[in-house]
Amino acid sequence: MAMVSEFLKQAWFIENEEQEYVQTVKSSKG
């Protein structure tokens, strides 16, 4: 169970970081 929650924590953070970076790039181009 701890392994599952650790995986989810990493996946959530990585997904958030990706989305935030995409937004940053879009706003700098726009």
Epitope: E6, F7, A11, F13, I14, E17, Y21, V22
Partner: antibody
């Protein structure tokens, strides 16, 4: 302008310790995960460690686990890497980089030489 | 031995198209996005491609990335002498709870 400036490298004997610092400016440091990446002379890149924005999660490469400690002081906009029990194979240029896995900004690096 | 596998070297002449491969597994490339970095001689690495195929602002559209399953590729078209550099792929690995790099590919522009 985003800037990352590493310091603290130098020559150290095997078994010794060193603390690297990375001073960040030009962005809201406390909002970002930060990482350390190293490169041995003439070799490829090796990820060393990463820390979440608030310091709540920390990750290490197996090669440094139990010997290196990453930390950050968000009030000083500074990232640290405490390196203990240093070995010859830790000799490398150490870079700090912004983010956990899209390293969009890198410092210029600081050279750590482990030799007797 | 790197977790992600890249050819150690690649070469091409000016104007040519060159591709660099990066092979991983289900715990890294298979489940996470791939990033590519360019390292010019004597300098720090620079972000080249993120999220498998996206270019940051300032990176020429001659550089493109793609991914299929557990492998990724970097393509450079219209090769120029200033493209001579080391190229690294990277991805987060869920099994290792660590970021992993490929061993790097040294690109030589001939002639």
């Amino acid at each position: 302008e985003v800037q990352l400036l590493e310091s603290g490298g130098g020559l150290v004997q095997p078994g010794g310790s060193l603390r690297l610092s990375c001073a960040a400016s030009g962005f809201t440091f406390s909002n970002y995960a930060m990482s350390w990446v190293r490169q041995a002379p003439g070799k490829g890149l090796e990820w060393v460690s990463a820390i979440y924005p608030g310091g709540g999660s920390i990750y290490y490469a197996d090669s440094v686990k139990g010997r290196f400690t990453i930390s950050r002081d968000n009030s000083k906009n500074t990232l640290y890497l405490q390196m203990n029990s240093l070995r010859a194979e830790d000799t490398a240029v150490y870079y700090c980089a912004r983010r956990l896995q899209i390293f969009d900004y890198w410092g210029q690096g600081t050279l750590v030489t482990v030799s007797s | 031995q790197s977790v992600l596998t890249q050819p150690p070297s690649a070469s091409g002449t000016p104007g040519q198209r060159v591709t660099i491969s990066c092979t991983g597994s289900s715990s890294n490339i298979g489940s996470n996005n791939v990033t590519w970095y360019q390292q010019l001689p004597g300098t720090a690495p620079k972000l080249l491609i993120y999220s498998d195929s996206h270019r940051p602002s300032g990176v020429p559209d001659r550089f493109s990335g793609s991914k299929s399953g557990t492998s990724a590729s970097l393509a450079i078209s219209g090769l120029q002498s200033e493209d001579e550099a080391d190229y690294y792929c990277g991805s987060w690995d869920y099994s290792l709870s660590a970021y992993v790099f490929g061993g790097g590919t040294k690109l030589t522009v001939l002639g």
